[in-house]
Interface confidence: low
């Protein structure tokens, strides 16, 4: 009956709308319902327009072009033509009243069967039942395995392949280790497997920035270093660096009213020129403080250098040397004044003598036939130099002297002119200011070194060279090189250093040959008011520690190897450094920080005087050490 109705409708459509033109009302009579009419009529008008204009474009946007108006109009009511369903996913299409119904194949869904069902995402069958990889395909899916696995016969489960058994030479010289789905070629720590050469190669950890500052790679490992000269030490993680911290604060207060005489290792600290009436005579008054035994306090001379006067210290006593056209004299006298106390000193030219007083008591009177400095053109012109000579004058002196003097002067009055502008000059320059309180000893500020050239060879000794060292130390920082021997090839065949211990608030003393620690004296509380004493002897056969302390040492066999390295170095040229190292590579020693604190050194029975050093950093104090900072109620 339904098909009969369709045929009738088709006949009416032919008659009403193809053989003749129909309006929408006439079309409504054909279809007898609004939905089909509303669907049909706009498309009918498109067919008419296309054929009337002769420029036919498919009325239903189909890929099939209709040959004539009849075909175009007849196709309008069939909802399944052209096919609205997805060809891949549909099973059938059913025409309806201005609608259609697509029936989908298994694995497809949607009004037009346009959507693939993802079986791999089915919550009722997780991962499509696959044990590893589920691959969704249009309208279906299949299981697969990861690399290193094979599919079982059930097409769903996977099994691991043992590559190491399949190919025994898979890893070459490395060890093959099977792991799920793969294999690993294992190398010892510090080595990495090279696929091309099938071998283990050293890892350059340094190129991977393992260290915070400096890194040295070696086969199978690496070592981190920190720049001790910039005040860093290696942290406990052996990678990062931390600042070397103060363990014993010192009183570094200075006063500009106190002139420091050792500001320069070599050279004048202050130079003054006087132009006074010819009746003036030389005079100098000042307070003086030192622990040094020898050096120049002041040197005065005439403009033409022909006459001069030297006020110095020798053996702790005041020495005066003078020379002019009339006479040449040297006198030493008075009490020892290198006692660290302030002593008032005055030197005054009288009519027939030069009077030297200490604490206002005359200690020397030097006769002179005429004026010390000869006036010219009605003026007495005099140049005065503190703590040094203006040029090489050794040959002119009556008795040579080491000019370097670690001391301070205050309350000076030269040529009866008072302080006359000198204080203003000194006030500007911090390094000319003296410490308010000092003790006996030498002070290393942690910023420089002193160099000595010492002959360690003892001709009468069958052992050849020997080093006997006594150190008296009061460190202010817990890490630093105290004593080092450096070869001409920039190696450090012997060093004695301080390092902060792993145990809190204590220090270790390490003795090293090149970069190997041969002795470690553990956990000493060295950062205290008390000075610590360390004594040892070294020769080519032995290192003997004379201070009874807890020692950690390398094996005797290894010690002999290291002493052989030292012996070889000692047969060449070595320089001795106190307070740190010169420019050697960071990896040359286990410690490279400068020593900070007080220290006296005796080598082979000789107390080293820093005034006698080949070179010395200006900030090292040869004969004065800052006091320990004392906490006051206000601080």
């Amino acid at each position: 009956a339904n098909s009969m109705l369709e045929e009738t409708k088709q006949g009416n459509l032919e008659r009403e709308c193809i053989e003749e033109l129909c309006n929408k009302e006439e079309a409504r009579e054909v279809f007898e319902n609004d939905p089909e009419t509303d669907y049909f009529y706009p498309k009918y008008l498109v067919c008419l327009r296309s054929f009337q204009s002769g420029l036919f474009t498919a009325a239903r946007q189909s890929t099939d072009a209709y040959p004539d108006l009849r075909s175009c109009v007849n196709a309008i009511p069939d909802q399944c033509s052209p096919l609205p369903c997805n060809e891949d996913g549909y099973m059938s299409c059913k025409d309806g009243k201005a609608s259609f119904t697509c029936t989908c194949k298994p694995g497809w869904q949607g009004e037009k069967c346009e959507f693939d069902i993802n079986e791999c995402k089915d919550p009722s069958n997780i991962n499509g039942g696959c044990s590893q990889i589920c691959d969704n395909t249009p309208g279906s899916y299949h299981c697969s395995c990861k690399s290193g696995f094979v599919m079982l016969s059930n097409k769903k489960d996977c099994k691991d392949v043992d590559e190491c058994s399949l190919k025994p030479n898979m890893c070459g010289t490395a060890v093959c280790k099977n792991i799920p789905g793969d294999f690993e070629c294992e190398c010892p720590e510090g080595y990495r497997y090279n696929l091309k050469s099938k071998s283990c190669e050293d890892v350059d950890e340094c190129s991977e920035n393992m260290c915070a500052q400096l890194c040295v790679n070696y086969p199978g490992g690496y070592t981190c270093y920190c720049d001790g000269k910039k005040g860093f030490k290696l942290a406990q993680d052996q990678k990062s660096c931390e600042a070397v911290s103060v363990c014993l604060p010192l009183n570094l207060d200075t006063k500009y009213e106190l002139l420091y005489l050792a500001e320069q290792f070599a050279g004048v600290v202050l130079y003054l020129k006087f132009r006074l009436p010819e009746i003036s005579r030389f005079s100098a008054e000042f307070d003086f403080r030192t622990y040094d035994s020898q050096g120049v306090i002041l040197y005065a001379e005439s403009i033409d250098h022909s006459a001069w006067l030297l006020i110095a210290l020798r053996g702790g006593k005041i020495e005066v040397q003078l020379k002019n056209e009339h006479t040449s004299k040297i006198t030493t006298g008075g009490d020892i004044i290198n006692n660290g106390l302030w002593n008032m000193v005055s030197v005054e030219e009288l009519e027939h003598s030069i009077s030297i007083k200490i604490a206002k008591e005359a200690v020397m009177d030097i006769n002179k036939p005429g004026p010390l400095f000869k006036p010219e053109n009605g003026l007495l012109e005099t140049k005065v130099y503190f703590a040094g000579f203006p040029r090489k004058v050794e040959s002119e002196l009556i008795k040579p002297i080491n000019p370097r003097l670690d001391g301070c002067i205050r309350s000076w009055n030269l040529m009866k002119q008072g302080a006359s502008g000198i204080k203003e000059i000194i006030q500007e320059k911090q390094n000319k200011h003296c410490l308010v309180t000092v003790e006996k000893g030498s002070y290393y500020p942690g910023s420089g070194i002193a160099e000595f050239h010492i002959d360690y060879n003892n001709g009468s000794n069958a052992e050849g060279w020997h080093i006997n060292v006594t150190l008296n130390i009061r460190p202010s920082m817990g890490t630093g090189v105290m004593l080092a021997l450096v070869s001409s090839n920039n190696t450090v065949p012997f060093a004695v250093s301080l390092v902060d211990s792993t145990s809190e608030k204590s220090q270790d003393i390490v003795i090293s040959v090149e970069n190997t620690v041969i002795y470690r004296i553990q956990a000493l509380s060295l950062c205290s008011n008390q000075r610590s004493h360390l004594e040892f002897r070294v020769n080519r056969n032995n290192l003997e520690l004379l201070t009874p302390l807890k020692i950690e040492t390398i094996s005797q066999e290894e010690l002999q190897t290291q002493l052989a390295i030292l012996d070889k170095a000692m047969k060449g040229k070595v320089a001795t450094y106190l307070g740190g190292l010169p420019d050697v590579p960071f990896s040359a020693t286990p410690v490279n920080a400068f020593y900070n604190g007080c220290m006296e050194v005796n080598i082979n029975g000789v107390e080293l005087d820093l005034d006698e050093a080949i070179s010395k950093h200006n900030d090292i104090r040869a004969h004065s050490c800052p006091s320990v900072w004392k906490k006051t109620k206000n601080s």
């Epitope: 915070a212 500052q213 890194c215 040295v216 790679n217 720049d227 860093f232 920039n490």
Partner: antibody, heavy 122, light 108 residues
């Protein structure tokens, strides 16, 4: 990726001051594990390291002895840059100037600026 | 200062051949404080090797370095056309950090 971009004049008169700037991207001038350097290259002297600046809880500089008396290298932290000042230049200072990063505390140079040809001439 | 001497001054080879460049220091630069650079015309030097033997990031494995103390070698196992340019060594064991005078690698 670290990049260094140089800027500054290509012509300087004798006795005047040569000034160049190096802008850093991809790293910080205050990086505790880097050093920022200036290197120059001329046919007569080849490649020559001039100096560097680096930060290790405070700023440090180190300079080659050959130019120490007339060189200043400064960090400009606000702009993530560093600069070179070379005073009292002579025609001998004519060269291509490069800025470069020193890796960690090492002084090998893993990143370089594009180079600036500076001619000293009146 | 440490003086680095590179040899030969110029090396003429063909693509595919092996190149061996030498760098000698006037005194020890420490075990491995030596770097190698490649410089193409109009460009800044490019780091190839640091620590005497450690290849820098992105450097092909045909480049390798060896040596310690005072004698160092850069080897290019199979020369590619782009490898024909100038190579410098540099020591960073002690300040001032110095460079060699360079070796020019040219096509035979």
């Amino acid at each position: 990726q670290v990049q260094l971009q140089q800027s500054g004049p290509g012509l300087v008169k004798p006795s005047q001051t040569l000034s160049l700037t190096c802008a850093i991207s991809g790293d910080s001038v205050s990086n505790n594990n880097a050093a920022w350097n200036w290197i120059r290259q001329s046919p007569s002297r080849g490649l020559e390291w001039l100096g560097g600046t680096y930060y290790r809880s405070k700023w440090y500089n180190d300079y080659a002895v050959s130019v120490k008396s007339r060189i200043i290298i400064n960090p400009v932290t606000s702009k993530n840059q560093f600069s070179l000042q070379l005073n009292s230049v002579t025609p001998e200072d004519t060269a291509v100037y490069y800025c470069a990063r020193g890796s960690s505390w090492y002084r090998f140079f893993d990143y370089w600026g594009q180079g600036t040809l500076v001619t000293v001439s009146s | 200062e440490i003086v680095l001497t590179q040899s030969p001054g110029t090396l003429s080879l063909s693509p595919g051949e092996r190149a061996t460049l030498s760098c000698r220091a006037s005194q020890s630069v420490g075990s491995s404080y030596l770097a190698w650079y490649q410089q193409k015309p109009g460009q800044a030097p490019r780091l190839l090797i640091s620590g005497a033997s450690g290849r820098a990031t992105g450097i092909p494995d045909r480049f390798s370095g060896s040596g310690s103390g005072t004698d160092f070698t850069l080897t290019i196992s199979r020369l590619e056309p782009e490898d024909f340019t100038v190579y410098y060594c540099q020591q960073y064991g002690s300040s001032p950090y110095t460079f060699g005078q360079g070796t020019k690698l040219e096509i035979k």
